[in-house]
């Protein structure tokens, strides 16, 4: 059994998240993940999910009673999602930590926008014709 | 020329982001994107970058002078990054809109954690042995 399972059960107790009523009104993440089978699509969604958990854990960083559980889960996320590549995790965390209200960050983001947009399409899909075909799909 | 280019230039003027000094102290996104060639790694990073721009644009949604530019750029992001797939964009936006301080959201997130973790590794890399190898890389 992966180390995170026991620690996640501990968090369930702490957050009172074990009851069946928690599942009322649908899921947050699981339903969305079920929609996407392509690896690159899954990464788009999982990137947001992992950053959500990191933010959640950050909010409870001073709560000693769950520190070990949180650290174990974060480490296992690092192994599973970032393939234990610290550079990947560091770059990810830099991106999640940029403040959207910081004026210098705003200026930089707008300054880089054209180049960022140019890189958004996967390499195989950069043909203009291909993109214009895409405009009409729901 | 893609439609976003002219509109991004318009935003540069609005944000006073055309000056060379904006590039001082390194880039926000471009340096990070340069580090990642694998499509799935790029999607992890681009997911955070796109959500940053969406948040930034949301903060300026009431500013009429840049509305057309913002809408054009968002639409082009939809074409390029979400492949004009509305379901993909909708799922993405759901994820970005969850509030990490909402108690019900917290409980649901912790309730789903074990299943989310189980799905984090790419299908081909779920072997326990492969993952344990990864524990020791920087």
């Amino acid at each position: 059994q992966d180390p995170y399972v026991k620690e996640a059960e501990n968090l369930k107790k702490y957050f009172n998240a074990g009851h069946s009523d928690v599942a009322d009104n649908g899921t947050l993440f699981l339903g969305i993940l079920k929609n996407w089978k392509e690896e690159s699509d899954r990464k788009i969604m999982q990137s947001q999910i992992v950053s959500f958990y990191f933010k959640l854990f950050k909010n409870f960083k001073d709560d000693q009673s769950i520190q070990k559980s949180v650290e174990t889960i974060k480490e296992d996320m690092n192994v599973k999602f970032f393939n234990s590549n610290k550079k990947k995790r560091d770059d990810f965390e830099k991106l999640t930590n940029y403040s959207v209200t910081d004026l210098n960050v705003q200026r930089k983001a707008i300054h880089e926008l054209i180049q960022v947009m140019a890189e958004l399409s996967p390499a195989a899909k950069t043909g203009k014709r291909k993109r214009s075909q895409m405009l009409f799909r729901g | 020329q893609d439609p976003y280019v002219k509109e991004a230039e318009n935003l540069k003027k609005y944000f006073n982001a055309g000056h060379s000094d904006v590039a001082d102290n390194g880039t926000l996104f471009l340096g990070i994107l340069k580090n990642w060639k694998e499509e799935s790694d790029r999607k992890i990073m681009q997911s955070q970058i796109v959500s940053f721009y969406f948040k930034l644009f949301k903060n300026f949604k009431d500013d009429q002078s840049i509305q057309k530019s913002v809408e054009t750029i968002k639409e082009d992001m939809n074409v390029k990054f979400f492949n004009s797939n509305k379901k993909k964009r909708d799922d993405f936006e759901k994820l970005t809109n969850y509030s990490v301080t909402d108690l019900n959201v917290q409980r649901k997130a912790i309730h789903e954690l074990i299943q989310v973790m189980a799905e984090l590794s790419p299908a081909a890399k779920t072997g326990k042995r492969k993952r344990s190898q990864m524990l020791f890389r920087g």
């Epitope: 550079k87 | 990864m134 890389r137 920087g138």
Partner: antibody, heavy 120, light 111 residues
Framework: EVQLLESGGGLVQPGGSLRLSCAAS????????MSWVRQAPGKGLEWVSA????????YYADSVKGRFTISRDNSKNTLYLQMNSLRAEDTAVYYC?????????????WGQGTMVTVSS | NFMLTQPHSVSESPGKTVTISCTRS????????VQWYQQRPGSSPTTVIF?????PSGVPDRFSGSIDGSSNSASLTISGLRTEDEADYYC??????????FGGGTKLTVL
């Protein structure tokens, strides 16, 4: 101050066994993954084995897989390398190395090394 | 598996600047951190650069590390060379299937 002190090296015949130890001090031992790296005489560095802080996960280089076993005793702040079926090509200085995920995978602290000679 | 290739030896006079390269054979150099280790004769290795360009405390700022994606290589630059810099220098990195790989080492001679 971090200290890593290896012991247990020596001369052994091909096919024989040795157990290396590394006594650690100056840091919270159980919080860190530990590794063994070796260096044959006049040659470069070669990573041998690693173990997680809890001891629950281990990994080995192909060249030693099935012959070497890494372990740790967190109550004694000690790392071990059990080496069986030794070969001439295992002759090297063996370094005990502390590393941390939060220092970018750099091998931050190295012991002084213990010499293992496999010869008949 | 990939390899990291370093020059066998380099030499330079005291006070000058020397650069040691480390070229990755396959995979992308920038997608994983590179470390550099110094090993003086008869001593254990010590880290002089980690995470591409960061110096551990105690390592002088004469030592700097960099990555060049276009040549798929990392570099260690030592400026203001001193006799005590004479040592072997090793680069090290990893990828998704190989936990750690060391370069073959470069012998730096200070003339």
């Amino acid at each position: 101050e971090v200290q890593l002190l290896e012991s247990g090296g020596g001369l052994v015949q091909p096919g024989g066994s040795l157990r290396l130890s590394c006594a650690a001090s100056g840091f919270t031992f159980s919080s860190y993954a530990m590794s063994w790296v070796r260096q044959a005489p006049g040659k470069g560095l070669e990573w041998v084995s690693a173990i997680s802080g809890s001891g629950g996960s281990t990994y080995y280089a192909d060249s030693v897989k099935g012959r070497f076993t890494i372990s740790r005793d967190n109550s004694k702040n000690t790392l071990y390398l059990q080496m069986n079926s030794l070969r001439a090509e295992d002759t090297a200085v063996y370094y005990c190395v502390k590393r941390s995920f939060d220092s970018g995978g750099s091998f931050e602290y190295w012991g002084q090394g213990t010499m293992v000679t496999v010869s008949s | 598996n990939f390899m990291l290739t370093q020059p066998h030896s380099v030499s330079e006079s005291p006070g000058k600047t020397v650069t040691i390269s480390c070229t990755r054979s396959s995979g992308y150099i920038a997608s994983s951190y590179v470390q550099w280790y110094q090993q003086r004769p008869g001593s254990s290795p010590t880290t002089v650069i980690f995470e591409d360009d960061r110096r551990p405390s105690g390592v002088p700022d004469r030592f700097s590390g960099s990555i060049d994606g276009s040549s798929n290589s990392a570099s260690l630059t030592i400026s203001g060379l001193r006799t005590e810099d004479e040592a072997d220098y090793y680069c090290q990195s990893y990828d998704d299937t190989t936990p750690w790989v060391f370069g073959g080492g470069t012998k730096l001679t200070v003339l």
